[in-house]
Interface confidence: low
């Protein structure tokens, strides 16, 4: 049928990158190249119906369904989803094609289903059908990797029992401290399950699949390093494997290492030793202590001793369930408009947490950093000096934790006014919460110095969206002030702001801002 328009249906997947998260734009900011959904004519259907290829979307993903219509003249359209009509506003691109879009932000179960687009052009009417479903990730898992000794070899295997099967990589670093960050040039990555080079300073294994990335660090005591001020602590859950590496370097091979648990030597089969010469001909020895499946009685102080170094210990604690320890009392902060400030939460947790910072229903990425004392810290600095409630939420397999923060920004009040036939109201969100005065302007008082005290009602209310306090003052109108100009002023320690209102004037009320 030559009357039928040329139609193209596309899917645009939007990346939830940090530049768009937290912005209140109605459209995601960054997108991948559009994916063609075909849009074939559906045979044996009453009327002209095009069907797009089925769309599978991850939970919380943001997408746009888009139709490009190559037809002469204007088009009008209507979206229908679950028997509800949705607004449709076509526009035209540079090639003069009609473009109709449906944006789905942060996909949820309720947004899955059939989206019908009815288009009316000058020549014909037709329908386009999109079927959107949520990708079934219920079966997906991502488990933290663990270590096993390779049979008959001095090597470790990294295992992560995850679905879909993860990519496993070793992350190795031979320098100290900060320079072992992931992006550092000192870090070497090996995408393999087996690792033979076990002498490095920092050894981690990471597993990644569609659900993200999880890492496990090989717990190490280095006898050549000054011991930490607090005893290193390792947490494990019952049934998990225990691996501790003791490492020591000496000028020659004339030294040995031993492991003890609570002053008793570890049983044969629960340790193995490796040694090598380093480039400067010093000897490096490592001694692994391992238990394939820990029980409660494996809790205790594990001490690595050397005939040539001071011994060092670590406390291994076996728990039945994971935990998150932190103080959950809410905290209030008050800062200047340009003061640098970060929220921070210090916590101890096992297994490692996943966390988010939330403000005004928007979520922000959460970074955590390990401290020397076994605690971790998460900081949030990206508040852009917006006052309100900030929420830190953390969870692991067994525990959840939420902490609330309130941020107050010190600033001079700004006054907004509104009036009705019976009263005038002024609102301000300055901080500290302002006090109010009302003044009457008259012939006797052209500078508006005559104070009004009768009929004034002040209150503070929580603006729920931001968790931000707003102060308001309402003046009930009396015959004495009808037809006069009145002035409401809000003041705090940073300054004063006023608005002038003409009472009882017909039509819209004029407001004169007066700072």
């Amino acid at each position: 049928n030559q009357d039928l328009p040329v139609i193209k249906c596309v899917l645009i997947n939007h990346k939830n990158n940090d530049s768009s998260v937290g912005k209140s734009s109605s459209y995601p900011m960054v997108s991948e190249s559009p994916e063609d959904l075909g849009c074939a004519l559906r045979p044996q259907s009453s009327g002209t119906v095009y069907e797009a290829a089925a769309v599978e979307v991850d939970v919380s993903a943001s997408i746009t369904l888009q139709v490009l219509v190559d037809a002469p003249g204007n088009i009008s359209c209507l979206w229908v989803f679950k028997h509800s009509s949705l607004n449709c506003q076509p526009h035209f691109d540079l090639q003069n094609r009609g473009v109709v879009s449906m944006v789905i932000l942060k996909m949820t179960e309720t947004q899955a289903g059939e989206y019908l687009l009815f288009i009316q052009s000058e020549a014909t009417n037709y329908t386009i059908l999109f079927t959107v479903s949520i990708r079934n990730t219920l079966l997906y898992t991502l488990r933290r990797p663990y270590f096993r000794k390779m049979e008959n070899q001095d090597a470790l295997v990294c295992i992560s029992e995850s679905v879909p099967e993860p990519i496993v990589e070793w992350v190795l670093c031979d320098s100290q401290g900060e320079s072992c960050k992931e992006e550092s040039p000192a870090v070497v990555k090996k995408e393999e399950k087996v690792l033979h080079e076990l002498f490095g300073t920092d050894i981690r294994c990471c597993a990644r699949n569609e659900l993200g990335r999880e890492c496990t660090r090989l717990f190490t005591i280095d006898l050549n390093q000054t011991p930490q001020t607090t005893l290193p602590q390792l947490f494990l859950k019952v049934g998990e494997p225990l691996w501790i590496r003791c490492k020591a370097v000496h000028v020659n091979h004339g030294f040995g290492l031993t492991w003890e648990l609570e002053n008793k030597a570890l049983e044969e089969g629960n340790y193995f030793e490796m040694s090598t010469y380093s480039t400067n001909r010093t000897m490096i020895r490592i001694l692994f202590a391992f238990v394939s499946s820990v029980a409660r009685n494996d809790t205790g102080y594990y001490t690595c001793s050397s005939s040539k170094h001071p011994s060092q210990s670590a406390l291994v604690t076996i728990v039945e369930k994971g935990f998150i320890n932190a103080t959950n009392s809410s905290e209030d902060y008050e800062i200047d408009q340009y003061e640098e400030f970060c929220f921070s939460v210090r916590f101890k947790a096992y297994p490692q947490i996943r966390c988010t910072w939330t403000f005004s229903r928007k979520s922000f990425p959460c970074e955590q950093k390990g401290l020397d004392n076994g605690y971790s810290i998460s900081k949030f600095c990206n508040h852009k000096h917006q006052p309100g409630e900030y929420i830190f939420h953390a969870e692991n397999d067994d525990a959840q934790f939420t902490k609330m923060f309130t941020l107050n920004i010190r600033r001079k009040p700004q006054v907004l006014a509104e009036a009705s036939a019976s009263q005038a109201s002024c609102f301000s969100d300055g901080y500290p919460l302002p006090s109010w005065t009302w003044k009457k302007c008259s012939d006797k008082s052209p500078n508006c110095t005559e104070e009004i005290t009768e009929g004034v009602w002040n209150r503070k209310a929580n603006r729920k969206v931001f968790g931000q306090w707003v102060s308001s003052s309402t003046l009930n109108m009396s015959e004495a002030i009808k037809g006069f100009l009145v002035k409401c002023c809000a003041y705090n320690s940073l300054g004063t702001s006023c608005e002038t209102i003409l009472l009882n004037s017909p039509g819209p009320f004029p407001f004169i801002q007066d700072n």
């Epitope: 009392s329 905290e331 209030d332 902060y333 008050e334 200047d336 107050n408 010190r410 500290p432 919460l433 306090w469």
Partner: nanobody, 111 residues
Framework: QVQLQESGGGLVQPGGSLRLSCAAS????????IDWYRQAPGKQREWVAQ???????HYEPSLKGRFTISRDNAKNTAYLQMNSLKPEDTAVYYC?????WGQGTQVTVSS
Amino acid sequence: QVQLQESGGGLVQPGGSLRLSCAASGSTFGRNYIDWYRQAPGKQREWVAQITSGGNTHYEPSLKGRFTISRDNAKNTAYLQMNSLKPEDTAVYYCRILDYWGQGTQVTVSS
């Protein structure tokens, strides 16, 4: 929850001095600003001075030079040292942290 308790007020002769204290309970004391306010009979409450978490001080211009604000984070306490007092300094003095206020302490300057 922060609780504030002012003390140190009293009757003093013109030209005399007083040192007001503001004791706070609550863990966020050191992180927050402290303000002193005062309210004279029949008048609006007015701001007197402020000390920031970093120890920077700000004063109501007409009081600068006579009043000094300070803080001791270890004791969770803020102070207002008032010298060369005048009758017009007679008021109830309040301290404030965030949106928490103390009950106030009365200062009367009279011969």
